[in-house]
């Protein structure tokens, strides 16, 4: 079973290589446990960037070495991806799964194109 998932079309990472966007889902049921996964699509390859499972009303917990952090509010998840370089530019897709209680629902957003520009190196000062 599926559901609507929304995310912005384009986001520009800041000069420190951090990009944030909101992933929203229209819950068709009363979910208490939600799993959010960020996928990166580049050159028709899809790779998992990070994932977190959380209980409604609680914080998202990503793995300690994850490049993602996030907060949740209702049916919105504010995702932040850190440490991005120009080569990480690509389409970042938000996948949301309502894990519990049944029935299971899953939805995938259209993706957010994240543009990352490596900062110019500072010129040496005399």
């Amino acid at each position: 079973k599926a559901m609507h998932v929304a995310q912005p079309a384009v986001v520009l990472a800041n000069s420190r290589g951090t990009a944030s966007f909101v992933c929203e889902y229209a819950s068709p049921g009363k979910a208490t446990e939600v799993r959010v996964t960020v996928l990166r699509q580049a050159d028709s390859q899809v790779t998992e960037v990070c994932a977190a499972t959380y209980m409604m009303g609680n914080e998202l917990t990503f793995l300690d070495d994850s490049i993602c952090t996030g907060t949740s509010s209702g049916n919105q998840v504010n995702l932040t991806i850190q440490g991005l370089r120009a080569m990480d530019t690509g389409l970042y897709i938000c996948k949301v799964e309502l894990m519990y209680p049944p029935p299971y629902y899953m939805g995938i957003g259209n993706g957010t194109q994240i543009y990352v520009i490596d900062p110019e190196p500072c010129p040496d000062s005399d």
Partner: antibody
Framework: EVQLVESGGGLVQPGGSLRLSCAAS????????IHWVRQAPGKGLEWIGW????????KYAQKFQGRVTISRDNSKNTLYLQLNSLRAEDTAVYYC?????????WGQGTLVTVSS | DIQLTQSPSSLSASVGDRVTITCRAS???????LAWYQQKPGKAPKLLIY???NRATGIPSRFSGSGSGTDFTLTISSLQPEDFATYYC?????????FGQGTKVEIK
């Protein structure tokens, strides 16, 4: 009392553009998915697209892709529909409707007539 | 896209009659995403049934919905004068959301 009130309809020249508004009241606007639906005279209902509660995401029916933009201003409790390159077939009553899946409240509609 | 085909397209009935309208989908639709609306001339549609079988707030018990998969039904158990209108089914996932072509219920 929940209310959705559309405005901005009227006579538009073929090739022109229109911007419709939908003013919401009586509920927490920023919590809801909102859709635009239209109905040509004497015809059935046709879905145009939706916008997510924050306004961060939109989805459009394929036939409107590239010609339509749905936006919202949550500080003003207002939804917008921008439709470009209008043609006679776009003559219809345009409705905004509340709800992610089923639409529990609808506006009264605003009539758009495309004619020279 | 999922096509919804309603039958009949129109029907004539009398007050007190039992009326059944069918909505057939071109592919399976989750009952969670099937709704029915009533529309009267010059007015906006009004939600009757959601989740295929749940009555919306304030809708009289003479309206009921049933079905699953590709076949759904709206039943009016005893037609009242205010029920003469056009009825639409709608599916809301996947996008695009689509409506049936409508069934007009007229006075016999």
């Amino acid at each position: 009392e929940v209310q959705l009130v559309e405005s901005g309809g009227g006579l538009v020249q073929p090739g022109g553009s229109l911007r419709l508004s939908c003013a919401a009241s009586g509920f927490t606007f920023s919590d809801y998915w909102i859709h635009w639906v239209r109905q040509a005279p004497g015809k059935g209902l046709e879905w145009i697209g939706w916008i997510s509660p924050s306004g961060g995401g939109t989805k459009y029916a394929q036939k409107f892709q590239g010609r339509v933009t749905i936006s919202r201003d949550n500080s003003k409790n207002t939804l917008y529909l921008q439709l470009n390159s209008l043609r006679a077939e776009d003559t219809a009553v345009y409705y905004c409707a509340r709800g992610a899946y089923e639409f529990d409240y609808w506006g009264q509609g605003t009539l758009v007539t495309v004619s020279s | 896209d999922i096509q919804l085909t309603q039958s009949p397209s129109s029907l004539s009935a009398s007050v007190g009659d039992r009326v059944t309208i069918t909505c057939r989908a071109s592919q399976s639709v989750s009952s969670r995403f099937l709704a029915w609306y009533q529309q009267k001339p010059g007015k906006a549609p009004k939600l009757l049934i959601y989740d295929a079988s749940n009555r919306a707030t304030g809708i009289p018990s003479r309206f009921s919905g049933s079905g699953s998969g590709t076949d759904f039904t709206l039943t009016i158990s005893s037609l009242q004068p205010e029920d003469f209108a056009t009825y639409y089914c709608q599916q809301s996932y996947p996008t695009p959301l689509t409506f049936g072509q409508g069934t007009k219920v007229e006075i016999k």
